[in-house]
């Protein structure tokens, strides 16, 4: 999916009120410094197209991000500010229900989540910069 | 400290495929950033071609996007470049890297293929 | 597409002596640049990252500076080892990062 069409705006409303509280909570107990940050993202597009492979990919060691509140609202976010994409979800759809049901918080899981924050820290960073 | 080595043909015939593999020691490519490769053809600059996340996402440049393929092997700690439809202009040292997604950290030290029949 | 353009081309001096090297970006890239140094039949090595920071194991000597279309490398005082091909690369314009055609530090 091409999140060039989407309305950035709406989207850092949307995380600053709930996802960023969602991942926070998510991450509580555990300090910013525990995880180094290995991915980044150069302009809003590419934030958006990292942030949702990050979120809705599993990956072999955490493999439940999906199932998560925090990627139930990134994806409704991003359904409803990005034309179209709602449509080209069908093969994540099916990953969410494929993700484990247990709610066990790896470290491997906190690791990906951190780089997440991340993720949506540079895309807020990148639309002040645009403003 | 994390170290790359790139192998495949020296010699490739126009209009074949070109495949590369980069094997990755001192980090597991599973575990974080990502993994890019980059071309320099002889006397000239920098190209970048593409790179791979650990989580799996994919991103390559638009100019040369129709004919490369970006994989991976976790279980060898190596990933690999398919270049298709070769010319003399794809003749280049090729250079795997280690990537953030914006800029590159570490590389491998680069090999020599030459698109020739 | 972004086009870097380095100057100059050929830069030719003395150890000991200060280098300042020029890239300048086709549009505004903001601080998303880096600067790589290369060697003879060596890869390129990350010198500088974001416009300003230095990588890991990069010596004081190595600075950059700049933000939206004009930057510059500066060698505060060029040892033996710093004679090679340096090269700008922005990071502002995904899909499409862009690297400058270099500029070679010679010994004069």
């Known amino acids: 999916y091409d999140f060039t069409n989407c309305d950035f705006q709406k989207i850092e409303a949307d995380y600053l009120r709930t996802i960023s509280k969602d991942l926070i909570t998510y991450m509580s107990g555990t300090k910013s410094t525990d995880f180094n940050n290995t991915v980044s993202c150069s302009n809003r597009p590419h934030c958006l197209t990292e942030i949702q492979s990050l979120t809705f990919n599993p990956t072999p060691r955490c493999a439940s991000l999906a199932k998560e509140m925090f990627a139930r609202k990134t994806k409704a976010t991003l359904a409803l500010w990005c034309p179209g994409y709602s449509e080209t979800q069908i093969n994540a759809t099916q990953a969410m229900k494929k993700a484990r049901k247990s709610k066990v918080t790896t470290n491997k899981c906190l690791e990906q989540v951190s780089q997440l924050l991340g993720l949506w820290r540079r895309f807020i960073r990148t639309l002040l910069k645009k403003q | 400290q994390v170290q790359l080595q790139e192998s495949g043909p020296g010699l490739v015939k126009p209009s074949e495929t070109l495949s590369l593999t980069c094997a990755v020691s001192g980090y597991s490519i599973s575990s974080g950033y990502g993994w890019s490769w980059i071309r320099q053809p002889p006397g000239k600059g920098l190209e970048w071609i593409g790179y791979f996340s650990y989580y799996g996402s994919t991103s390559y440049n638009p100019s040369l996007k129709s004919r490369v393929t970006i994989s991976r092997d976790t279980s060898k700690n190596q990933f690999s470049l398919k270049l298709s439809s070769v010319t003399a202009a794809d003749t280049a040292v090729y250079y795997c890297?280690?990537?953030?997604?914006?800029?590159?950290?570490?590389w491998g030290q680069g090999t020599l293929v030459t698109v020739s029949s | 597409e972004i086009v870097m353009t380095q100057s100059p081309a050929t830069l030719s001096l003395s150890p000991g002596e200060r280098a300042t090297l020029s890239c300048r970006a086709s549009q505004s890239v903001s601080s998303n640049l880096a600067w790589y140094q290369q060697k003879p039949g060596q890869a390129p090595r990350l010198l500088i990252y974001?416009?300003?920071s230095r990588a890991t194991g990069i010596p004081a000597r190595f600075s950059g500076s700049g933000s939206g279309t004009d930057f510059t490398l500066t060698i505060s005082s060029l040892e033996p080892e710093d004679f090679a091909v340096y090269y700008c690369q922005q990071y502002s314009n995904w899909p499409q990062y862009s690297f400058g055609q270099g500029t070679k530090v010679e010994i004069k």
């Open positions: 890297a280690r990537t953030n997604l914006l800029y590159f950290d570490s």
């Open positions: 974001d416009a300003s």
